[in-house]
């Protein structure tokens, strides 16, 4: 069964700044990456980016940086300031669509004790 | 404007073999996903064929497992649905359709159909 | 298998009048549910995706709502041209699966 998994990480520089990590481990081929904060896409999570391996990136604020890793992997760089960043206890998603399998998906958050710069 | 036209439908008597097309224009063909559905009469509609962009990925449920073979051209912009093995019970109208990745692969384009009847 | 139960099967109603149609998945299906309409003698045409948005040229009266496992059409005032048959649809997880349809018909 394919799964996937979400790194959160605080940036040691911007304390407000973090870098989410997330992987598709299956066979099929990837479709579409959706990144979303506050829950899944689905139950009331925010979109912060989208990813298609054809047509592109798109992404909305906060996130500045999003980008392909690996074929099966993507990372996002999320802005530190302004009223819409995240705080440490936010919730990320992700969610990968495969075809013609599906979708798969899975949350991830920054440890409670987590150090700047330590993986989730 | 998207277009897809399905032809090669036809009587067949049972266990004989028929070859579906469908010609696509109006879209990158190549950068979708492309299905095959069908609706019986009376009844409801269902999946029994789907090509990932690639090519590489196909899906049959189990009803079709084995008797049917979906493939694609694109350099001709078409689709195609081997059925060999025919049954009464797949008699029905056939539709090509295509796959938005960014609409959760929602079906966003649909031919008008071709009729297969397998009859004695 | 995520089984799409649908209902009801029929309904009679007329024109001008508020309808919602029902749609439940057998487990979570998360945002990725669909809605078709079906008229006799045409092909299925994409009303729904994302279980809330509106496809391109669809009306407004139209309109997609739910998470998780429970889902609803809603058309706010019904049109002649709206009686049809209409198909939820999840492609959350293969093997992708219809419901059996409900059939809109004039009172």
């Known amino acids: 069964t394919p799964e996937v998994w979400v790194q959160v990480r605080m940036e040691a520089t911007e304390l407000s700044s973090f870098t989410i990590r997330c992987g598709f481990l299956g066979s099929g081929s990837i479709s579409l990456v959706t990144v979303s904060w506050g829950g899944p896409n689905g139950a009331g999570g925010t979109t912060l980016a989208v990813l298609h391996p054809e047509r592109g990136i798109r992404q909305w604020a906060p996130a500045r940086q999003a980008r392909w890793e690996t074929q099966s992997s993507i990372s996002l760089i999320l802005e530190g300031s302004g009223a819409s960043s995240p705080c440490a206890n936010t919730t990320f998603c992700c969610k990968f669509a495969s075809f013609p399998e599906g979708s798969w998906e899975a949350c991830g958050s920054l440890p409670p004790s987590s150090d700047p710069g330590l993986s989730a | 404007e998207v277009q897809l036209v399905e032809s090669g439908g036809g009587l067949v008597q049972p266990g004989g073999s028929l070859r579906l097309s469908c010609a696509a224009s109006?879209?990158?063909?190549?950068?979708?996903?492309m299905s095959w559905v069908r609706q019986a009469p009376g009844k409801g509609l269902e999946l029994v064929a789907a090509i990932s962009r690639d090519g590489d990925s196909t899906y049959y449920p189990d009803t079709v497992k084995g008797r049917f073979t979906i493939s694609r051209d694109d350099a001709e912009n078409s689709l195609y649905l081997q059925m060999n093995s025919l049954r009464a019970e797949d008699t029905a109208v056939y539709y090509c359709s295509r796959h938005e990745d960014y609409f959760g692969f929602a079906m966003d384009s649909w031919g008008q159909g071709t009729l297969v009847t397998v009859s004695s | 298998e995520i089984v799409m139960t649908q209902s009801p099967p029929t309904l009679s109603l007329s024109p001008g009048e508020r309808v919602t149609l029902s749609c439940k998945a057998s487990?979570?299906?998360?945002?990725?549910v669909a809605w078709y309409q079906e008229k006799p003698g045409q092909a299925p045409r994409l009303l729904i995706y994302y279980v809330s948005h509106r496809f391109t040229g669809i009306p407004a009266r139209f309109s997609g709502s739910g998470s998780g496992t429970d889902f609803t059409l809603t058309i706010s005032s019904l049109q002649p041209e709206d009686f049809a048959v209409y198909y939820c649809?999840?492609?959350?997880?293969?093997?992708?699966?219809f419901g059996q349809g409900t059939k809109l018909e004039i009172k």
């Open positions: 487990q979570s299906v998360s945002n990725d």
């Open positions: 649809h999840q492609a959350y997880r293969s093997p992708w699966t």
């Open positions: 109006g879209f990158t063909f190549s950068s979708y996903h």
